[in-house]
Amino acid sequence: ANSLLEETKQGNLERECIEELCNKEEAREVFENDPETDYFYPKYLVCLRSFQTGLFTAARQSTNAYPDLRSCVNAIPDQCSPLPCNEDGYMSCKDGKASFTCTCKPGWQGEKCEFDINECKDPSNINGGCSQICDNTPGSYHCSCKNGFVMLSNKKDCKDVDECSLKPSICGTAVCKNIPGDFECECPEGYRYNLKSKSCEDIDECSENMCAQLCVNYPGGYTCYCDGKKGFKLAQDQKSCEVVSVCLPLNLDTKYELLYLAEQFAGVVLYLKFRLPEISRFSAEFDFRTYDSEGVILYAESIDHSAWLLIALRGGKIEVQLKNEHTSKITTGGDVINNGLWNMVSVEELEHSISIKIAKEAVMDINKPGPLFKPENGLLETKVYFAGFPRKVESELIKPINPRLDGCIRSWNLMKQGASGIKEIIQEKQNKHCLVTVEKGSYYPGSGIAQFHIDYNNVSSAEGWHVNVTLNIRPSTGTGVMLALVSGNNTVPFAVSLVDSTSEKSQDILLSVENTVIYRIQALSLCSDQQSHLEFRVNRNNLELSTPLKIETISHEDLQRQLAVLDKAMKAKVATYLGGLPDVPFSATPVNAFYNGCMEVNINGVQLDLDEAISKHNDIRAHSCPSVWKKTKNS
């Protein structure tokens, strides 16, 4: 019925308005309603103006799309011609009374279907239902995935790509670790991944200035070292250096009135020359203090070296050796005086004898025919040496003696000339001053070492070599090397060191082979005024130790490998060092600071006498140790 009505309307329009001209009223009769009439008539007039006979040619060339009046007029009532809808977005166009209706395709909206619906922003379907990326497109949308993910068949959800399984060689020699959307190439600690070579490379931490002083890089790590010889140790952060601090203060007070006889490891402390009237005779008076058992107190000789007198200590007793044109004698006598107390000693040449007194009591009287030293030109010229003698004398002694003597003298009076002139010389030389108070023992001041040659292979046991060490120690600082065996190639196959413990006011003892700690005795209170006793025994198969707290045989997985390193070194030559290390690289041992404190060492049953060392730093005191500093009420 509707289409019949439309056909009728079309016929009437043809008859009324195309074949003839119609006015608005006549047009109203065709459409039978105002809205369509009002819509039609102005457009009808435009058609008439365009196509009436006699109109200018320019008008016909206008934008009018119709070839003639009929088609122009017939098109006016059809609201869908020309198409008002957005061509991309519409599905159909429905003509209405002076209006049109565009039906949109899915994904489009608006009166003319001109607006794309953004499905990605639809609140009822968040992100368009996509699990990762929603891409809006004109009239539609699609889901996509981030790098490292693939789309599932539902075209909405994404799944992580396991690059490690997909490409086993993706990380080369490193370990591939899959992570959401990506992968990582992992290296062991101390290594970093090189993208270029697809391999793990050692990180040179040393080039990154990780350490305060010395840094040694090694594959997979690094170690910081501090110059122990300059008094530094590694701090707890294992990077910075701190000063090795004193844990037990010592009384290092000295007096210039006290002459220290062991200032030089080899050599004379003081040399005096006397030119006196010929009636003079040799005499020496002094107070003497030592714990040493052997050494030269003084040596006197004539100007031409033909006659000499030696006053020494052997086995703790006074020994006199003398030689001149008349006689050659050696005498030892009196009580043991290496007791650490001040003993008054006097040696006086009498007319027929030499008298030796201790505490004013005669202990020896040595007969002599004639004067000890022969005067010449009316003068008695005598040279006196303290704590030593000229090197050439050594071969002339009646009985050889180790000249080194750790002791002090005071209140001296030589050749009855008093102490004039001597005190002034000593006063200016700090290292000639003696400590006011000392105790028995050997003192390592933290500035040098002593070297011994000990043959550890001199045993008939199956082990081939052994090192049995007993240490009596009273450290003054909590860090330092007490004993070290050093190979010719500057390695340290065995060392016993002290380090400050992480727990406050205690120390650890480290046993090391080269730069590896093979055993650590933790948290011992060694910085006390009491000596601590440590023992350890090591051979190629075992390591035993005893401390004040325990006795144990050490065994762990790595020990045999480390003992094999030590065994190899012991079969060659090793030098024994006390109190520190010689010039070896910082990295040769875990600790390189000098030991500071008192220490007595017994190796393979022999008590080591520092006077017998191959070499010894002058500041090391072989037979005296400073007392612990006692805090007085005033200080």
Partner: antibody, heavy 117, light 106 residues
Amino acid sequence: QVTLKESGPGILQPSQTLSLTCSFSGFSLSTSGMGVSWIRQPSGKGLEWLAHIYWDDDKRYNPSLKSRLTISRDTSSNQVFLKITSVDTADTATYYCALYGNYGDYWGQGTTLTVSS
Amino acid sequence: QIVLTQSPAIMSASPGEKVTMTCSASSSVSYMYWYQQKPGSSPRILIYDTSNLASGVPVRFSGSGSGTSYSLTISRMEAEDAATYYCQQWSSYPLTFGAGTKLELK
């Protein structure tokens, strides 16, 4: 002596596919540790890395261009290739191939591409 | 991606003068490369793996740095050193270059 030489079409129209060849000598791309990259440089501008191929045929691409790039190689003829689809005027640049390897890094002289309609 | 920022963008130096240019990374990198490019030429590698001098490069060039901060130093500028210098990171994909530092002769 290591040498690398790039070759390409010189001029392309927008939407066409660019095919570049890097011919090299003095090393083998099948040797462990070797890799070849493609880098480009628009005139008067900076360098932009495009893709890398490793000795084991592992390939890496610049994500911003990944959908358009394909890197490949022919170890027997000592050549590495790069394809870029749907070129645009923004792809006008000098294209370099570079060897990154164990024995040092070397670049070719470059080949110039102009994209113009 | 790691963004590399080079500074200064342009600088000038007299012959014999010490020159230092920097490359700052948006996140930590392990391996930094430095290139020299002269007009009409391809880039030439100067420094690889942060501080290693490439073959044939004069010893007046040196590289240093770690983490996010790197630098290239020319101990004594020479006329032939006038060029543009680029840093490149080899720590993660995509590989990236700095925008360059143009070094001119004063």
